[in-house]
Each structure stands twice: as structure tokens, then as C-alpha cells.
Interface confidence: medium
């Protein structure tokens, strides 16, 4: 029975050209986590597998760092970045738990004057 | 445990199109774990890796056959596929898939042979 | 792009004989992204050891890897008769190349 519950930064806004740290974090479960997805829409940005260390997909390899912990770093933001971002947690032996971000890459002007999604 | 099974032509005519379906079983090639590779061998000489694609469609490709090379999942079906364009005799080779978990291989077909020559 | 050169191309051994293969790499590797894998006539390669030292499901523990950075080893401690087969090394950076192979063959 997968009793664990995804916790992530829910809705956030980041400036053009900034950055924007991706967090997840796995709770009320004893799992192991073996290995952590980061997704976009449709692709993949990362992957942390706890034996193996970081693989940043080639596409992303020059604007994606790994971490803090288990989270993923995303730099030099366009506002084609706006959108869903995943989280797939792969543990044993609970399986697979996957939790939802998602991002809104403002313009400058109107990154000054407040975001419309704040971190929970 | 994943099987996968590589199907198609065993003979293309140079400058054709050489097309290859992979099917998996044994587990979902939606699977976020897995990667879908393919890999070639040359008549008695060593391993070339051609390209990869994930479940959500994203490839990477080897640069040196990226112009020729496309590679597409079929969720449905269960396999992916490999298209090489425009090939010569040079293409002649063991055609291999396999799932890869990002750092290495780990299951792979049997592999296909398949010869360029008109 | 890195390129892994394996030595020696032949090996010569007789079944219970210790066998040492060697990958070097043209840059540096990560240990995470070096894998070694046998290939027996006819058939597809089969992954022996990933990330350096780690076995793969399976794999006896006569066959154990080693190494970093540039230099990496293959070791078999004690030969067995079906362990005769060609033996690749792989690399993955940002794309996956292969050594070009060992032949470990019967003397």
C-alpha cells in the first residue's frame, strides 16, 4: 500500500533570464527512494538515481544543475520555460509517486511589480 | 524481467530507407526508468550507439548519424522504432535494442542483421 | 567525443587463470559512467559490471571492475570455460561510445 505523500513548491513564478530551484520532497512513507525524474511537458530533464549520481539530459545540459538534495536548478530562464514540471519518485517498495510543479517565467517589468503565484 | 525483440527487413537497397520495430515485453515502455536505445555492429567489428528515445518522446541522437537517423516510441504497441535514411553499404551491421537506464544497457534484443545491397 | 582504448586487443589464457583487462579513456569518466559488458558469438552483448564495480543481476563474483578517471580494469579471478567470449568497455558522457573490444580466447 503506497501510503507516502508528494510535497513540492506547488505554483511559482521566476524572472527572465533568472533562475528557479525545482523542489520535491517525499513524506510519511518509509520507502527507499532509488531514483528521482525531474520531467518536463514532454521531456526529460534529469534524473537522480541514488546509486549512480546525476544524468542531465544533453538537451538541458548547459541551463540545468543538479540539486539542492534531490531538487533540480534551472538557469537562465526563458518564458518558454513556463509550464508543468514533474517529479517522479521511484522507491521500493511503495513504486512510483509523482508530484506536479508549476512554473511561470515572467517578463522583468512584470516580475518587479509581484508574481501572480507565490510559494506555498 | 524486460524482453525486447528487434523485427524488419533483413536486406535494404542502398540509398533507401532501413526501418527496424522494437517490442518490449515484460514491462511498459512508458516506464519512466527506461530509456530506448538502439545499437549497431558491423560484420566482426565493434559497437556503435546510434540514438535513444524516452517514453515522453525526447531523443538524443549519436552526431555523427543525426542527419539520417529518426526514432519514435508507440506507446500502444509497446515498441519503438529506428529509421536510418539514405543508406550504403557502410550501414550493413547487427542491429540492437535495448533499454538503457541512462548510464548503460542493461537488456537488449537479440539482434537484427541487416545488409545493404542492391 | 571520448574514446576508450582497450588492451590488450587478445588475450590468451587457460581456464582457471586469472584474466586483467584494461579501458583507458581518452578524457576523464566519471565511475558512474563506465560499464563492461561480454559478448559471446551470435549473441547480443550482456552487461557485467556498471558504474566501475557494480555487478550486474546475475554476474558471479568471479568478475569484479575497478578503476577511475582514465584507467579502468576488467578483472576475472579465475577463468571459466564459458567466460571465453570478446569483452567491451562503455563510457557514458554526453553521448555513449564503446572500446573497441578484447578478445579473451582459449590457449
Known amino acids: 500500500m503506497m501510503t507516502g505523500t508528494i510535497e513540492t513548491t506547488g505554483n511559482i513564478s521566476a524572472e527572465k533570464g533568472g533562475s528557479i530551484i525545482l523542489q520535491c520532497h517525499l513524506s510519511s512513507t518509509t520507502a527507499q527512494v532509488t531514483q528521482v525524474n525531474w520531467e518536463q511537458q514532454d521531456q526529460l530533464l534529469a534524473i537522480c538515481n541514488a546509486d549512480l549520481g546525476w544524468h542531465i539530459s544533453p538537451s538541458f545540459k548547459d541551463r540545468v544543475a543538479p540539486g539542492p538534495g534531490l531538487g533540480l536548478t534551472l538557469q537562465s530562464l526563458t518564458v518558454n520555460d513556463t509550464g508543468e514540471y514533474f517529479c517522479i519518485y521511484h522507491t521500493y517498495p511503495d513504486g512510483t509517486y509523482t508530484g506536479r510543479i508549476f512554473l511561470e517565467v515572467l517578463e522583468s517589468s512584470v516580475a518587479e511589480h509581484g508574481a501572480r503565484f507565490q510559494i506555498p | 524481467q524486460l524482453q525486447l525483440q528487434e523485427s524488419g527487413p533483413g536486406l535494404v537497397k542502398p540509398s533507401e530507407t532501413l526501418s527496424l520495430t522494437c517490442t518490449v515485453s515484460g514491462g511498459s515502455i512508458s516506464s519512466s526508468r527506461y530509456f530506448w536505445g538502439w545499437i549497431r555492429q558491423p560484420p566482426g567489428k565493434g559497437l556503435e550507439w546510434i540514438g535513444y528515445?524516452?517514453?515522453?518522446?525526447?531523443?538524443y541522437y549519436n552526431p555523427s548519424l543525426k542527419s539520417r537517423v529518426t526514432i519514435a516510441v508507440d506507446t500502444s504497441k509497446n515498441q519503438f522504432s529506428l529509421k536510418l535514411s539514405s543508406v550504403t553499404a557502410a550501414d550493413t551491421a547487427v542491429y540492437y535494442c535495448?533499454?538503457?537506464?541512462?548510464?548503460?544497457?542493461?537488456?537488449w534484443g537479440q539482434g537484427n542483421l541487416v545488409t545493404v545491397s542492391s | 567525443e571520448i574514446v576508450l582504448t582497450q588492451s590488450p586487443g587478445t588475450l590468451s589464457l587457460s581456464p582457471g587463470e586469472r584474466a586483467t583487462l584494461s579501458c583507458r579513456a581518452s578524457?576523464?569518466?566519471?565511475?558512474?559512467?563506465l560499464a563492461w559488458y561480454q559478448q559471446k558469438p551470435g549473441q547480443a552483448p550482456r552487461l557485467l559490471i556498471y558504474?566501475?564495480?557494480s555487478r550486474a543481476t546475475g554476474i558471479p563474483d568471479r568478475f569484479s571492475g575497478s578503476g577511475s578517471g582514465t584507467d579502468f580494469t576488467l578483472t576475472i579471478s579465475r577463468l571459466e570455460p564459458e567466460d571465453f567470449a570478446v569483452y567491451y568497455c562503455?563510457?557514458?558522457?554526453?553521448?555513449?561510445?564503446f572500446g573497441q573490444g578484447t578478445k579473451l580466447e582459449i590457449k
Open positions: 562503455q563510457q557514458y558522457g554526453s553521448l555513449y561510445t
Open positions: 528515445i524516452y517514453y515522453r518522446g525526447s531523443t
Open positions: 578524457q576523464s569518466v566519471s565511475s558512474s559512467y
Open positions: 535495448a533499454s538503457s537506464s541512462a548510464w548503460y544497457f542493461d537488456y
Open positions: 558504474g566501475a564495480s
